[in-house]
Interface confidence: medium
C-alpha cells in the first residue's frame, strides 16, 4: 500500500520544510486517494469485463451514488464555496458505506482498499475543520446504511463486480470534481 500523505520519504528527509497548509494537505489527501482508486480499478478491470460495459448498462444502475450537480455550486459557473463544501463533505459521508462494501471485494489489493477507506475518513475530518456551516451537513442514517450494505453483499457475483466498478468510477469522478472545486477556495 502507498505511504499515507505526510509520511513519505521526502517529508522525513526534509524536516525543516514548511509544514503543509490546510489546503495543501487536503489536495494531497485527495490525490493520494485517487492513486488508491486507480490501483483498485486496475484489479477490477483485470478480473472482469465490467470496465468495457456499455454506458447504457451503467446508466441503469440504481445505486444512488453521490454525484455533483449544477445546484451544488462546485462547478465554475455558479460556484459557491459554502454550498460546495457542504456538498463535498455530505457526498464523502454518503460514500463511506460503499467504501465499507469494497473491503471484501479485493484479493491482491486488500490493503489498498483499506487505505482508501481510512484516508477518506481523514479527508472528511480535514474538510469538517474547514467548513463554517457544519449544521448544513446531513449524516447518513446508520440503520439505512446497514441495510444497504446487507443488500449489496447479497448480490450475485456479476452484480457485485458491476457494483464495485460503479462505486470506484463514481468515487473517482466525485473526488476529481471536489479537487477542482477545492482549488478555487
Amino acid at each position: 500500500a502507498p505511504v499515507p500523505p505526510g509520511e513519505d520519504s521526502k517529508d522525513v528527509a526534509a524536516p525543516h520544510r514548511q509544514p503543509l497548509t490546510s489546503s495543501e494537505r487536503i489536495d494531497k489527501q485527495i490525490r493520494y486517494i485517487l492513486d488508491g482508486i486507480s490501483a483498485l480499478r486496475k484489479e477490477t478491470c483485470n478480473k472482469s469485463n465490467m470496465c468495457e460495459s456499455s454506458k447504457e448498462a451503467l446508466a441503469e444502475n440504481n445505486l444512488n451514488l453521490p454525484k455533483m450537480a449544477e445546484k451544488d455550486g462546485c462547478f465554475q459557473s455558479g460556484f459557491n464555496e459554502e454550498t460546495c463544501l457542504v456538498k463535498i463533505i455530505t457526498g464523502l459521508l454518503e460514500f463511506e458505506v460503499y467504501l465499507e462494501y469494497l473491503q471484501n471485494r479485493f484479493e491482491s489489493s486488500e490493503e489498498q482498499a483499506r487505505a482508501v477507506q481510512m484516508s477518506t475518513k481523514v479527508l472528511i475530518q480535514f474538510l469538517q475543520k474547514k467548513a463554517k456551516n457544519l449544521d448544513a451537513i446531513t449524516t447518513p442514517d446508520p440503520t439505512t446504511n446497514a441495510s444497504l450494505l446487507t443488500k449489496l453483499q447479497a448480490q450475485n457475483q456479476w452484480l457485485q463486480d458491476m457494483t464495485t466498478h460503479l462505486i470506484l468510477r463514481s468515487f473517482k469522478e466525485f473526488l476529481q470534481s471536489s479537487l477542482r472545486a477545492l482549488r478555487q477556495m
Epitope: N49, S53, E56, A57, L58, E60, N61, N104, E107, K151, Q153, A154, Q155, N156, Q157, W158, L159, M162
Partner: antibody, heavy 120, light 111 residues
Framework: QVQLQQSGAELAKPGASVKMSCKAS????????MHWIKQRPGQGLEWIGY????????EYNQKFKDKATLTADKSSSTAYMQLSSLTSEDSAVYYC?????????????WGQGTSVNVSS | DIVLTQSPASLAVSLGQRATISCRAS??????????MNWFQQKPGQPPKLLIY???NQGSGVPARFSGSGSGTDFSLNIHPMEEGDAAMYFC?????????FGGGTKLEIK
C-alpha cells in the same frame, strides 16, 4: 474435466452433527464460489448458502444461518458443510454446486449429492 | 425473499409436441439489463442439470429444443419437439439476490 465428489451417506441421531465434504478437481478451486443446496425426498430445492474459497467469505440463507456452517480447505480443494442440532427435518440430499462465473453466475457442475438420514 | 411460482405443477405432452412451463417471480429479477433467471432439469436419482441461464441462454451441451424467454417477473421454458428423454422435473431459479431461490418444480411426463 470438472468434478465435484461428495462424501458418502450419513446416518445420524437427532441432536447430533454431521460434516460432509465436496472435493473439487479439474479446475482452480479458489476461482469459483461453491454453493450448497438441500433437497428433501420428492420435494423442491432450497439454497443453503455459498462460500468463496479464496477468501472464506460466506453468505447464508437466513433459514439455515444457525443450522449450516460452510468452510473450505484450499490445500485439498475441498469444501465442507457442517449441519448441527439435527432433526428429522434435516433428512435430505445435500448437493454442492460450483458457481461458474464468466459473464453471469450459473451453477454449472453439481456433486452427486450426500444423503443425510436423521433417525433415532 | 424472492418467491418463484411455477405452473403447471405437472404436465403431460405428446412426443413431438411443445411443452411450456411458466415461472413468475414476486419481484423483478432484472439488473443492469440482465434477467437473473436460470432453468434446471432433474431426473430421478441425479443432481439438477443447467438448461438455460440469464433467461434465454443455453447451457453447455443443451439441445436447441430447449429455449427460455421472459424478463422482469414473467419467464417461460419451452421444449419443442418433445422427446422421450425430456420426461423429468424442471425448476426455475433466481440468482439476483440472496437467498437464491427455486420454483416449486414442474413434473413433465410423456402423454
Amino acid at each position: 474435466q470438472v468434478q465435484l465428489q461428495q462424501s458418502g451417506a450419513e446416518l445420524a441421531k437427532p441432536g447430533a452433527s454431521v460434516k460432509m465434504s465436496c472435493k473439487a478437481s479439474g479446475y482452480t478451486f479458489t476461482s469459483y464460489w461453491m454453493h450448497w443446496i438441500k433437497q428433501r425426498p420428492g420435494q423442491g430445492l432450497e439454497w443453503i448458502g455459498y462460500i468463496n474459497p479464496s477468501t472464506g467469505y460466506t453468505e447464508y440463507n437466513q433459514k439455515f444461518k444457525d443450522k449450516a456452517t460452510l468452510t473450505a480447505d484450499k490445500s485439498s480443494s475441498t469444501a465442507y458443510m457442517q449441519l448441527s442440532s439435527l432433526t428429522s427435518e434435516d433428512s435430505a440430499v445435500y448437493y454442492c454446486a460450483r458457481d461458474y462465473y464468466d459473464y453471469e453466475d450459473v451453477m454449472d457442475y453439481w456433486g452427486q449429492g450426500t444423503s443425510v438420514n436423521v433417525s433415532s | 425473499d424472492i418467491v418463484l411460482t411455477q405452473s403447471p405443477a405437472s404436465l403431460a405432452v405428446s412426443l413431438g409436441q411443445r411443452a411450456t412451463i411458466s415461472c413468475r417471480a414476486s419481484e423483478s429479477v432484472d439488473g443492469f439489463g440482465i434477467s437473473f433467471m436460470n432453468w434446471f432439469q432433474q431426473k430421478p436419482g441425479q443432481p439438477p442439470k443447467l438448461l438455460i441461464y440469464a433467461a434465454s441462454n443455453q447451457g453447455s451441451g443443451v439441445p436447441a429444443r430447449f429455449s427460455g424467454s421472459g424478463s422482469g417477473t414473467d419467464f417461460s421454458l419451452n421444449i419443442h419437439p418433445m422427446e422421450e428423454g425430456d420426461a423429468a422435473m424442471y425448476f426455475c431459479q433466481q440468482i439476483k439476490e440472496v437467498p437464491w431461490t427455486f420454483g416449486g418444480g414442474t413434473k413433465l411426463e410423456i402423454k
